[in-house]
Amino acid sequence: ELCDDDPPEIPHATFKAMAYKEGTMLNCECKRGFRRIKSGSLYMLCTGNSSHSSWDNQCQCTSSATRNTTKQVTPQPEEQKERKTTEMQSPMQPVDQASLPGHCREPPPWENEATERIYHFVVGQMVYYQCVQGYRALHRGPAESVCKMTHGKTRWTQPQLICTGEMETSQFPGEEKPQASPEGRPESETSC
């Protein structure tokens, strides 16, 4: 079941998943000047079964000049606000995701992909937060958020992380402790 909302936004922090649960969508977004091909899917889908999962559909981008599109007149800043999800300059493989049944690895980049990946997560997904460069993490608890189902509605737990403006960066849990993966975590909360 898809989570209704996006994970919480923490000032001066980004989040990422170590692996993606089946049913997760990754939007086919393209960088400026390029567009999803006309016959292309809206998204890639993590699909499969408990023993093997993979990404279904392929994202393809084409030059926007070759498509019947109109440029929006509202001026868009080239640098938008701090990115809250995966930035694609550094593809991530922080843990051995093959050991997570029912999960997909981070999919490889596609040509002319946008810098920011837009995921639609499913119930039970866990994401991990880290402070952006130039900010230091003050932990009051786990720097992670889980999408849970409660009383028929989805919600993300609040990560216990504050990022302060000191020139020291923290790592994602999986990068400093490879065992800190979604394995063994509660997948959903259905009791009311």
Epitope: G23, K38, S39, L42, T69, Q72, T74, Q76, H120
Partner: antibody, heavy 114, light 107 residues
Framework: QVQLQQSGAELVRPGTSVKMSCKAA????????IGWVKQRPGHGLEWIGD????????DYNEKFTGKATLTADTSSSTAYMQLSSLTSEDSAIYYC???????WGQGTLVTVSA | DVVMTQSQKFMSTSVGDRVSVTCKAS??????VAWYQQKPGQSPKALIY???YRYSGVPDRFTGSGSGTDFTLTISNVQSEDLAEYFC?????????FGGGTKLEIK
């Protein structure tokens, strides 16, 4: 909570135009396409087109090229659709949709009548 | 354009029954199909994405299946609140297209 709030019903004259709005809340407006869908009794649902507020690109169903104009204002997280040269065929409920069709607005009823 | 055909405009069923709504695409659309439920006077509600994945809050009596050109929405243990019109949609290629709808009537 993700919400798409559409503007109210419109009663308009043939030959004129109408502009309706769709205000998004509860998610990052610039991250997701916003599409528009037309519904007329006996005609089912028709996809009009969509706009990406972040990239600013727009796609139209060829059937609605020249009829519909899609715009978006990122400062207010609002998408707009203008319909021109209205006829009775344009009398319908118009929905905005987002987040890969997961979320739908409540609809705007447009009635074209002399 | 891809034509999505829902051959049955109306279906009649009883509470507790199992009913299957079908949808046929004029060409291969993979699993890029969604199902929507629309109750009288309301906007459509998304039930299923990618042919078989349920959205949050959708009861598990709603099941989607199929790929390629043939798709089915199955409602097991039909409830009175399932009285609605059901639409399929393909988003495999532009322009995205919808089926004509199937109205479910409860006996």
């Amino acid at each position: 909570q993700v919400q798409l709030q559409q503007s109210g019903a419109e009663l308009v004259r043939p030959g004129t135009s109408v502009k309706m709005s769709c205000k998004a809340a509860g998610y990052t407006f610039t991250n997701y396409w916003i599409g528009w869908v037309k519904q007329r009794p006996g005609h089912g649902l028709e996809w009009i087109g969509d706009i990406h507020p972040g990239g600013g690109y727009i796609d139209y169903n060829e059937k609605f090229t020249g009829k519909a104009t899609l715009t978006a204002d990122t400062s207010s997280s609002t998408a707009y659709m203008q319909l021109s040269s209205l006829t009775s065929e344009d009398s319908a409920i118009y929905y905005c949709v987002s987040r890969n069709f997961a979320k739908w607005g409540q609809g705007t009823l447009v009635t074209v009548s002399a | 354009d891809v034509v999505m055909t829902q051959s049955q405009k109306f279906m009649s069923t009883s509470v507790g029954d199992r009913v299957s709504v079908t949808c046929k695409a004029s060409q291969n659309v993979g699993t890029n199909v969604a199902w929507y439920q629309q109750k009288p006077g309301q906007s459509p509600k998304a039930l299923i994405y990618s042919a078989s994945y349920r959205y949050s809050g959708v009861p598990d009596r709603f099941t989607g299946s199929g790929s390629g050109t043939d798709f089915t929405l199955t409602i097991s243990n039909v409830q009175s609140e399932d009285l609605a019109e059901y639409f399929c949609q393909q988003y495999n290629s532009y322009p995205y297209t919808f089926g004509g709808g199937t109205k479910l009537e409860i006996k």
